[in-house]
């Protein structure tokens, strides 16, 4: 997260760290007791490493009573996701067992009504992604509030030049932004999961290159079918 601040510890109990061989790779969001939603491209970066999900964490390195690392029973990328595009960039991870719920571990309600968030709405994005252009990684969860940007502006030539579909949404990126390592994490508007950070190799913090988020409401049928 660029231009953000440290999150209040355990105030986002839905927050997950998707890890490979014990290292943070991507964000994720607990959407059901045994399921974490993330970004499909995160799996590409995992190669053949062991994928696990850390729940109940604030610090990645320090011991915390609520922290627990879960193995992944099943990884289900969206069937239409492709390495060369950010379309359908969603991944569902089934944990090896149901998560132990508590104040620091709780699923987040996700948007099922397929309606755009009003441009200008402030939404919260959180993650353990880099906090500087130099690539500094934080140990503790960071967050930032970002205004939603309308799709017509986001599709302008010097922004994303027509690449933003109805199934994506954008948020402003003027110095405050999601960045590398935040992919798969949640964009939360009014206490509801609206978007998942896409995992393209986008320049961060440049106002002309808004953050791109996959709209979960657009994938309600797929999410329900996998979770069923």
């Amino acid at each position: 997260i660029l231009g953000g601040r440290e999150a209040e510890a355990h105030a986002r109990p839905y927050m997950a760290s998707v890890q490979v061989n014990g290292e943070h790779l991507c964000g994720g969001v607990l959407v059901a007791e045994q399921w974490v939603l993330s970004a499909a491209h995160c799996l590409e970066d995992a190669a053949d490493g062991k994928v696990q999900v850390l729940l109940g964490a604030h610090s990645l390195s320090q011991p915390e009573p609520s922290k627990r690392l879960y193995d992944v029973l099943r990884a289900v990328p969206h069937p239409d996701s492709r390495p060369d595009t950010i379309d359908h960039d969603l991944l569902l991870l089934q944990l090896s067992e149901k998560a132990t719920l508590g104040p620091a571990v709780r699923p987040l309600p996700w948007q099922r009504v397929d309606r755009d968030v009003e441009p200008g709405t402030l939404c919260d994005v959180a993650g353990w992604g880099i906090v500087s252009h130099a690539g500094r990684r934080p140990d503790r969860l960071q967050h930032v509030l970002l205004p939603v940007l309308d799709r017509a502006t986001c599709n302008r030539r010097t922004h994303h030049d027509g690449a933003i579909t109805q199934r994506m949404m954008c948020a402003e990126s003027n110095r405050r932004d999601s960045c590398k390592g935040d992919s798969g994490g949640p964009l939360v508007c009014g206490g509801v999961l609206e978007g998942v950070v896409t995992s393209g190799s986008r320049v961060c913090g440049n106002r002309k290159k808004p953050g791109i988020y996959t709209r979960v409401a657009s994938y309600a049928a797929w999410i329900d079918s996998v979770l069923a």
Epitope: R151, A152, T153, N155, R156, R157, T158, D161, V203
Partner: antibody, heavy 116, light 112 residues
């Protein structure tokens, strides 16, 4: 497939008003801004500005501030260009052009002739 | 405004020839994001312009590989390796990096 279909040619007198339409199909209208480009007879292309089809906010190039107005009828996926107090130098073909990627999608053009 | 100067304004060719059109901008048109939004369009008589090349050298979908774009800073070139009858028309360079976006005056590619 993506199409922009413009209204037919117009013959107007100086001082009158003309309103040109551009109906979009094959994509979600609100997701891509609409530009307007002027081409005088035997002349080159000049960008007039654009309208944000999501918010309805127009942006005009300096030479097209005042007598020119962009508007929308979103429910009909249609953009409009209105030119008031027409002058002889407004005689031109006017194109609507969708944003993204580049200017890949153009209307067929509407010829406006201003003559006494 | 950024002035786009094309040369030549008229280019007589024979079919099968290589054609080269130059475009010079009055300002460096690299955008703050590192991209150069330099595009080339072809307008045939009585038709709307068509996008050929974007970001200096990328061919738009369906554009034959006879067309290639190059350049940086303020100097850009469009090359057509073997001119076909379907290539005749007016070619415009365009910059989208600075508002207002601007077109060159056009180069008419015609038969000798």
């Amino acid at each position: 497939q993506i199409q922009l279909v413009q209204s037919g040619p117009e013959l107007k007198k100086p001082g009158e008003t003309v309103k040109i339409s551009c109906k979009a199909s094959g994509y979600i209208f609100r997701n891509y801004g609409m530009n307007w480009v002027k081409q005088g007879p035997g002349k080159g292309l000049k960008w007039m500005g654009w309208i944000n089809t999501y918010t309805g906010e127009p942006t005009y190039a300096d030479d097209f501030k005042g007598r020119f107005a962009f508007s929308l009828e979103t429910s009909a996926s249609t953009a409009y260009l209105q030119i008031s107090n027409l002058k002889n130098e407004d005689t031109a073909t006017y194109f609507c052009v969708r944003d993204g990627p580049g200017f890949a999608y153009w209307g067929q053009g509407t010829l406006v002739t201003v003559s006494a | 405004d950024v002035l786009m100067t094309q040369t030549p304004l008229s280019l007589p060719v024979s079919l099968g020839d290589q054609a080269s059109i130059s475009c010079r901008s009055s300002l460096i048109i690299e955008h703050s994001d590192g991209n150069t939004y330099l595009e080339w369009y072809l307008q045939k008589p009585g038709q709307s312009p068509k996008l050929l090349i974007y970001k200096v050298s990328n061919r738009f979908s369906g554009v034959p590989d006879r067309f290639s774009g190059s350049g940086s800073g303020t100097d850009f070139t469009l090359k057509i390796s073997r001119v076909e009858a379907d290539d005749l028309g007016v070619y415009y360079c365009f910059q989208g990096s600075h508002v207002p976006v601007t077109f060159g005056a056009g180069t008419n590619l015609e038969l000798k």
